[in-house]
Structure formats: structure tokens, C-alpha cells
């Protein structure tokens, strides 16, 4: 999948665009909005009826090197009595993000954009019923 | 920056950290993952904390379309299908990295940008505060 060219007619390619070799693009990895913070309600991963745990994956050849993944704790959801109820199910909610992957080929280094699917948390759903033939 | 293992046979000129600017292949590796959450799952309707998905489009960004979740109710849906306000629907937010055209309108020059998206909602026990 390629990055789409700017296709709108009102976009004129400015003279100030940097020269880029064919088949590649220039990427500045100094992140815009680096210091913005998630403003989620506190400890929702423990207070949810579909609670989850976090695990951190670390890869020094990826930027950012640290990616946090959620894992649902239960198959069912936690009911008002604090017990697991499997008539309802905890399911993962996922979101794509981009990372930069560094590849070593011999002594040369290349960079590749990669889509990563991150599990962000869990939600409680009514399961779909299937009758298997 | 990030320290990386180096092939010991290579010249020592390579920086151990990611450089500030890199040239990357135009092809994005990975996954023809389904970018439309409406198609990929119907959890947004089946959840006890259901949400609506709003399309956020920006041609200066890649991906240009991002779906934002907004919880439908303050409470959660109980077994009878009614909204129960003893529990709360709250958004699950995630910081993601996208590409921002920089300078603006340039076809092949980008900068990474961190944006905060609401991905879905989950049902939580509210924290009870006693205000003096």
C-alpha cells in the first residue's frame, strides 16, 4: 500500500518541497505533539466490566521502540456481584498506528514504514450465536 | 534516541540512534488491515457501552481518514436493554502515530505526528467522590 499522492486540484506542489529520490519519501521522526497526554479516566483497565492488563513490547529496531498492548483478562464480563459472567464476552478493541522499522542488510541500513495493530483495551459485548453444521 | 545492536563487522560510522530524518520506502509494510472499523467489527453496536463512529478526514495527513468513537450514553446498557446509570460508558483513548505533510502540500515529505484518538468505549464502575 502506497502513500497516496496529494490528488486534490487545489493543492499545488510548493517550490519549497525537498528533492526526494524516486520510490521513497523524506520522513522527519521528530514527533509533533510528543508531549500530549492521554486524558482517560483513572484505572479504567481495572474498573471496566471487561478488564484488561497491559504488556509492553520492546524492539530496538522499531521507532517508537516501545509499544503497549492490552490483553483482556477474562472471556466473560464482570457482573455486579464481581463474578465472571460468560453470557457476555470481553473483546479487544484495536487501532492501527504507524511505526518506522529499521532493516539491516549487510552494513547498509534502510527504513520502512509499518502498520501495527495495537490492542487498546476491551469492551463487553453480547456474543454472536452460530449454529455449526 | 534508541540504542541498537550493530553488526560488529561494519564500519563504526553508523549512529546507534534513529536519525532525526530518514528516507523511507513509499510502500507501507504490513497488513492490508481493515482501516474501516465499521466493516471490521460490529462491537460498537453490541457493546454494553456502545459508541458511534465519526469520520475525521484530513488530506494533509496519512492516513487521511481516522474514525473517532463517541460513547452513546453516560450509562451502560443492562440485561433489559435499558441505560443503567450506576455504571458509566467511558472512551478508551490511544495515542497513534500518523504522517503529516511537511512542508504542507508536499507529496513525498512528512513528519511523524502523535494524535489522540478515542477508539471505542468500555463500561466502568464510576469512582464515587464525597465533596466536602
Amino acid at each position: 500500500r502506497k502513500i497516496p499522492k496529494v490528488g486534490h486540484t487545489f493543492f499545488q506542489k510548493p517550490e519549497s518541497c525537498p528533492p526526494v529520490p524516486g520510490g521513497s519519501m523524506k520522513l522527519d521522526i521528530g514527533i509533533i505533539n510528543e508531549n500530549q497526554r492521554v486524558s482517560m479516566s483513572r484505572n479504567i483497565e481495572s474498573r471496566s466490566t471487561s478488564p484488561w492488563n497491559y504488556t509492553v513490547t520492546w524492539d530496538p529496531n522499531r521507532y517508537p521502540s516501545e509499544v503497549v498492548q492490552a490483553q483482556c483478562r477474562n472471556l466473560g464480563c464482570i457482573n455486579a456481584q464481581g463474578k465472571e459472567d460468560i453470557s457476555m464476552n470481553s473483546v479487544p478493541i484495536q487501532q492501527e498506528t504507524l511505526v518506522v522499522r529499521r532493516k539491516h542488510q549487510g552494513c547498509s541500513v534502510s527504513f520502512q514504514l509499518e502498520k501495527v495493530l495495537v490492542t487498546v483495551g476491551c469492551t463487553c459485548v453480547t456474543p454472536v450465536i452460530h449454529h455449526v453444521q | 534516541g534508541i540504542t541498537i545492536p550493530r553488526n560488529p563487522g561494519c564500519p563504526n560510522s553508523e549512529d546507534k540512534n534513529f536519525p532525526r530524518t530518514v528516507m523511507v520506502n513509499l510502500n507501507i509494510h504490513n497488513r492490508n488491515t481493515n482501516t474501516n472499523p465499521k466493516r471490521s467489527s460490529d462491537y460498537y453496536n453490541r457493546s454494553t457501552s456502545p459508541w458511534n463512529l465519526h469520520r475525521n478526514e484530513d488530506p494533509e495527513r496519512y492516513p487521511s481518514v481516522i474514525w473517532e468513537a463517541k460513547c452513546r450514553h453516560l450509562g451502560c446498557i443492562n440485561a433489559d436493554g435499558n441505560v443503567d446509570y450506576h455504571m458509566n460508558s467511558v472512551p478508551i483513548q490511544q495515542e497513534i502515530l500518523v504522517l503529516r505533510r511537511e512542508p504542507p502540500h508536499c507529496p513525498n515529505s512528512f513528519r511523524l505526528e502523535k494524535i489522540l484518538v478515542s477508539v471505542g468505549c468500555t463500561c466502568v464502575t464510576p469512582i464515587v467522590h464525597h465533596v466536602a
Epitope: 472471556l75 464476552n89 454472536v128 449454529h131 | 462491537y43
Partner: nanobody, 115 residues
Framework: EVQLVESGGGLVQAGGSLRLSCAAS????????MGWYRAAPGKQRELVAI???????NYADSVKGRFTISRDSAKNAVYLQMNSLKPEDTAVYYC?????????WGQGTQVTVSS
């Protein structure tokens, strides 16, 4: 696509034993539950026994002490050992397989207990 293969039903005299088995294939998840429900003629389907994540079990009161559920996680299979069978255990027994967000029901295997 999930497949469920049920076996072990049949005709048995009161006081006898049967062993039901059900193997699931196609979609395997870290979190899952497997078990058995039953439906007697003219009655609603009811829980017999389930096992969640290969660990915790849940039995209907009417079968406690007589039926034992077990699981082979490597084969993704569940077994129901039914001892001291009674005529009121006569029913179609349905394999149940639950993975996050989806419940799969087998076609059922007939268990008939004669007095």
C-alpha cells in the same frame, strides 16, 4: 471457520455411564470456554457443565457429583463423563464453544436413558 465434532451419545440403561466428546477446530483463542448444554423434549436448552480457559468449571445442580467435565487444551477438546445416569438425563446434548464475541453450538448428540 469453526468446526465442532461431537460424539459419544447413545442409549444406556439407568445407572449406566456415557462419555461425550467435542473437538473444536478452525479458530483457537487464548480465552475460551467449552462445555455442554442439553435440551429435553419440549424444554429449553439448559446448562450441563462448562469449563472456562481450561480451569474453572460450572455444573448444573442436577448433575453435580455424577458428571465430570474435562478438557484437552492441546486438542481443543472437551469431554463429559456421565455416571449414574437417570431417565431425566435423556436429552439432546449440545457442544458449546465460546471465543471472545462468538458462541458456537454443535448439532447435538442424542442421549437416551431407559429405565
Amino acid at each position: 471457520e469453526v468446526q465442532l465434532v461431537e460424539s459419544g451419545g447413545g442409549l444406556v440403561q439407568a445407572g449406566g455411564s456415557l462419555r461425550l466428546s467435542c473437538a473444536a477446530s478452525g479458530v483457537i483463542f487464548r480465552l475460551n470456554a467449552m462445555g455442554w448444554y442439553r435440551a429435553a423434549p419440549g424444554k429449553q436448552r439448559e446448562l450441563v457443565a462448562i469449563i472456562v480457559n481450561g480451569g474453572s468449571t460450572n455444573y448444573a445442580d442436577s448433575v453435580k457429583g455424577r458428571f465430570t467435565i474435562s478438557r484437552d487444551s492441546a486438542k481443543n477438546a472437551v469431554y463429559l463423563q456421565m455416571n449414574s445416569l437417570k431417565p431425566e438425563d435423556t436429552a439432546v446434548y449440545y457442544c458449546y464453544y465460546n471465543i471472545p464475541g462468538d458462541v458456537y453450538w454443535g448439532q447435538g448428540t442424542q442421549v437416551t436413558v431407559s429405565s
